[in-house]
């Protein structure tokens, strides 16, 4: 059962796992949600009736029954983790805490103009978990405007105290706002020889990398595969750090793999969701339950639905016994990972999918595409929407992309002459325009947010957000696309597609079926040569064949240039402008979305 509200002046008795410090009960709830075992918590607020050393304590708790006895206590605030809830969860915390000093290891001290600048510094520093900033009113002259970057083993403060004229806050890495590089490569036959901060068991290097990503201190990792010579180290995932933030030594070793934390790209790739099955693999751990199940998929469902289950092993049925049902062992451990991994015993293992909701919805795998052909199939581009105007008559106006459950990203030039959002209708999950009838459900538009530097498509800033009147329920036919990571600026995308219902030639009409075309990206230097009369800025991205023939055209505007990278689709461009359509040596020009990630997040996350 999902309980989101906080219980004031209430304390849960017993079940303690650990105590951390958090600046608010709300953040305590987030910490509890991300902890592998925490189901309930009790937070102590500042209060004259409480011992100041207990202020801001967040006691993480567990219970076999998923609840604990309640006791009345002034200043105590209790609640449940969001593990029991189905809604999307985020660790992003933009709150600034006034007159609080969050204690940790002060590893960097510098002057900053504002708390915001200090927070940005923390977000772009690989080690920083949180910061404290002394304002210009701080009593001690030499400490005024000082920005202290801090880290701890747990990622949360070691203590929190009241201190006048300072403010504290957390790194915004988990809000996708870091400019740090996003290095997704996994290096085979490589060991990083730096200090280990922790070690866990993992079935493969990908899971190891994802564990490193959501471990507060891990910057990179080394994984020993099941073929590693030393038996005791097989399937061992070593979580590592270094002072520089990079591995100091790389050693060539067969059967080992190494890689980096994906912290800077975690909003656009799954880091909590381990969805694979591991055949002929047994996960060991504390047994929670043994249930009969028809298949390993059914076993995974059972684990996902049991809130305390973290991983499972399924042993298929022997011949015809037990109605063809096998045994499903639901398991847990102190850190969420198996205590040991064994091979060759016939089991099929995997993880709960309960944590998938902590990942961005946009990372969910979608239907495999149909290669070749220009007409799309249903569910192939589930983020693509058709934006209709009702003026003078109802018609397709522009394309757009779902980037959040209330947000569509599109082009600013689509709204020339549109005086009110009320006259617009957004249709999602559409393949053919002919499906849209008078009674077809649509999303009304609450607000049109056009970039304030936009003047005309050719001069850039051709980007706009539509805030919908109601939220989109994600399904196979309507779901978001990931924004590119700022850390991915140097990625070379090779699998890019433009989609839309636009014209197929310059003098044509809107197409009935959603069209698709695979188009190569063109460097900005090359693109500039093709458009001598225009300035192709770094905020634009170009795509097209030298010989022409495939391109976006009228009616495709605002739609996505979608590129697949590491099995995840990213919204790399927004169809903006071009000279004619599909002309030789005239690539299409798109808004370069990565350059607007801050703007998008600022607008969509505004309170």
């Amino acid at each position: 059962e999902c309980v989101t509200q906080l219980l004031k002046d209430t304390c849960f008795e017993g079940g303690d796992i650990t105590t951390v410090f958090t600046p608010s009960a709300k953040y305590c709830q987030v910490v509890c949600t991300y902890h592998p075992r925490c189901l309930l918590f009790t937070f102590t607020a500042e209060s004259p009736s409480e011992d100041p050393t207990r202020w801001f304590t967040c006691v993480l708790k567990d219970s076999v029954t998923e609840t604990l006895p309640r006791v009345n206590r002034t200043a105590a605030i209790s609640g449940y983790s969001f593990k029991q809830c189905s809604h999307q969860i985020s660790a992003c915390n933009k709150d600034i805490y006034v007159d609080l000093d969050m204690k940790g290891i002060n590893y960097n001290s510098s002057v900053a103009k504002s708390a915001q600048e200090c927070q940005e510094r923390c977000t772009d520093d690989v080690h920083c978990h949180f910061f404290t900033y002394a304002t210009r009113q701080f009593p001690s002259l030499e400490h005024r405007n000082i920005c202290l970057l801090k880290h701890t083993q747990t990622g949360t403060p070691t203590r929190i105290t009241k201190l006048d004229k300072v403010v504290s806050g957390f790194s915004l890495k988990s809000c996708a706002l870091s400019n740090l590089a996003c290095i997704r490569d996994i290096f085979p036959n490589t060991v990083f020889a730096d200090s280990n901060i922790d070690s866990v068991m993992a079935p493969d290097a990908f899971v190891c990398g994802r564990i490193c990503t959501h471990h507060p201190g891990c910057l990179f990792f080394t994984f020993f595969s099941q073929e590693w010579p030393k038996e005791s180290q097989r399937n061992l995932c070593l979580l590592k750090t270094s002072e520089s933030g990079l591995p100091s030594t790389r050693i060539k070793k067969s059967k080992a793999l190494s890689g980096f934390s994906l912290q800077s790209c975690r909003h656009s790739i799954p880091v909590f969701c381990h969805s694979s099955f591991y055949h002929d693999t047994d996960f060991l751990g504390e047994e929670l339950d043994i249930v009969a199940a028809k298949s390993h998929e059914a076993c995974q469902k059972l684990c996902t639905n049991a809130v305390r289950c973290q991983f499972f092993t399924y042993t298929p049925a022997q011949a015809s016994c037990n109605e063809g049902k096998g045994k499903c062992y639901l398991k847990l451990s102190s850190n969420g990972s198996p205590t040991k991994i064994l091979h060759g015993r016939g089991g099929i293992s995997g993880y709960t999918l309960r944590l998938c909701k902590m990942d961005n919805e946009c990372t969910t795998k979608i239907k495999p595409r149909i290669v070749g052909g220009t007409a799309s199939v249903r569910g192939e581009w589930p983020w693509q929407v058709t934006l209709h105007t009702t003026s003078p008559t109802q018609r397709h106006l522009c394309g757009g992309s779902i980037i959040g459950n209330q947000w569509i990203l599109t082009a600013a030039h689509c709204f020339y002459g549109v005086e009110s959002p009320k006259i617009l209708r957004v249709y999602s999950g559409i393949l053919n325009q002919s499906e849209i009838k008078e009674d077809t459900s649509f999303f009304g538009v609450q607000e049109i947010i056009i970039h304030d530097q936009y003047k005309m498509a050719e001069s850039g800033y051709d980007i706009a957000l539509l805030k919908l009147e109601t939220t989109v329920n994600y399904t196979d036919s309507q779901r978001p696309i990931c924004l590119p990571s700022k850390g991915d600026r140097n990625v070379i995308y090779t699998d890019c597609w433009v989609t839309g219902w636009g014209y197929r030639k310059l003098r044509d009409k809107i197409q009935n079926t959603l069209q698709k075309a695979k188009i190569p990206l063109v460097t900005n230097e090359e693109c500039q040569k093709r458009y001598r009369g225009h300035k192709i800025t770094h905020k634009m991205i170009c795509a097209g064949y030298r010989e022409g023939g495939k391109d976006a055209c009228k009616g495709d505007s605002g739609g996505p240039l979608s590129c697949k990278h590491n099995e995840v689709w990213h919204l790399v461009g927004i169809t903006s402008w071009g000279e004619g359509c599909a002309q030789r040596e005239r690539p299409g020009v798109y808004t370069n979305v990565v350059e607007y990630v801050d703007w998008i997040l600022e607008k969509t996350q505004a309170v």
Epitope: S391, R395, E419, S420, K422, I423
Partner: antibody
Framework: QVQLVQSGSELKKPGASVKLSCKAS????????MHWVKQAPGQGLEWIGN????????NYDEKFRTRATLTADTSTSTAYMELSSLRSEDTAVYYC??????????WGQGTTVTVSS | NIVMTQSPSSLSASVGDRVTITCKAS??????VSWFQQKPGQAPKLLIY???NRYTGVPDRFTGSGSATDFTLTISSLQAEDVADYHC?????????FGQGTKLEIK
């Protein structure tokens, strides 16, 4: 069922103003554009303008922009057209019509306006 | 402004005849053309929308065709009750405009 009921005939002197009404029922008034069309005796149809009741967005033909004012009262689902500085050539039947999904699908019965001294 | 030129301005035909009325737009209006029927003393009624889609309840002897600039309304077999004025109109762009109308009579 969708119905548009217009106000009764009007006899006006040149220079005067007239305000015609069009009461809508049977559909969500705020979600459809309401258009006004003029038909002079023995002539074709002439578009005056339209209004979107949910936002009061309006469009006018240049010819009528200075003299026609379109308004809507969402509480009573009624659209209005006021025509000022009347002259003899304004003598006509005025229709309100709903712009449906793709076309003007429902029309009022029309209001006859006669401008005569 | 887009000018819609309708022809003929009047025509007389016998019951059972095939009747064609044309409408020419001064610029491309894609398929944003509607046809209306107006009987004496009545308001216009929608017959065809989107150049070729028959509106609900309209007999299938009425057919619309065309795109871009040239549009046609065809009555495959004229009936006595089809005596009326017929108007074409474009809703591609503001200001919306209509043809001058065609008066259809029975011989």
């Amino acid at each position: 069922q969708v119905q548009l009921v217009q106000s009764g005939s009007e006899l006006k002197k040149p220079g005067a103003s007239v305000k015609l009404s069009c009461k809508a029922s049977g559909y969500t008034f705020t979600r459809y554009w309401m258009h006004w069309v003029k038909q002079a005796p023995g002539q074709g149809l002439e578009w005056i303008g339209n209004i979107y009741p949910d936002s009061d967005s309006t469009n006018y033909d240049e010819k009528f922009r200075t003299r026609a004012t379109l308004t809507a009262d969402t509480s009573t689902s009624t659209a209005y057209m006021e025509l000022s500085s009347l002259r003899s050539e304004d003598t006509a039947v005025y229709y309100c019509t709903r712009m449906g999904f793709y076309a003007m699908d429902y029309w009022g019965q029309g209001t006859t306006v006669t401008v005569s001294s | 402004n887009i000018v819609m030129t309708q022809s003929p301005s009047s025509l007389s035909a016998s019951v059972g005849d095939r009747v064609t009325i044309t409408c020419k737009a001064s610029e491309n209006v894609v398929t944003y053309v509607s046809w209306f029927q107006q009987k004496p003393g009545q308001a216009p009624k929608l017959l065809i929308y989107g150049a070729s889609n028959r509106y609900t309840g309209v007999p299938d002897r009425f057919t619309g065709s065309g795109s871009a600039t040239d549009f046609t309304l065809t009555i495959s077999s004229l009936q006595a009750e089809d005596v009326a004025d017929y108007h074409c109109g474009q809703s591609y762009s503001y200001p919306l405009t209509f043809g001058q109308g065609t008066k259809l009579e029975i011989k």
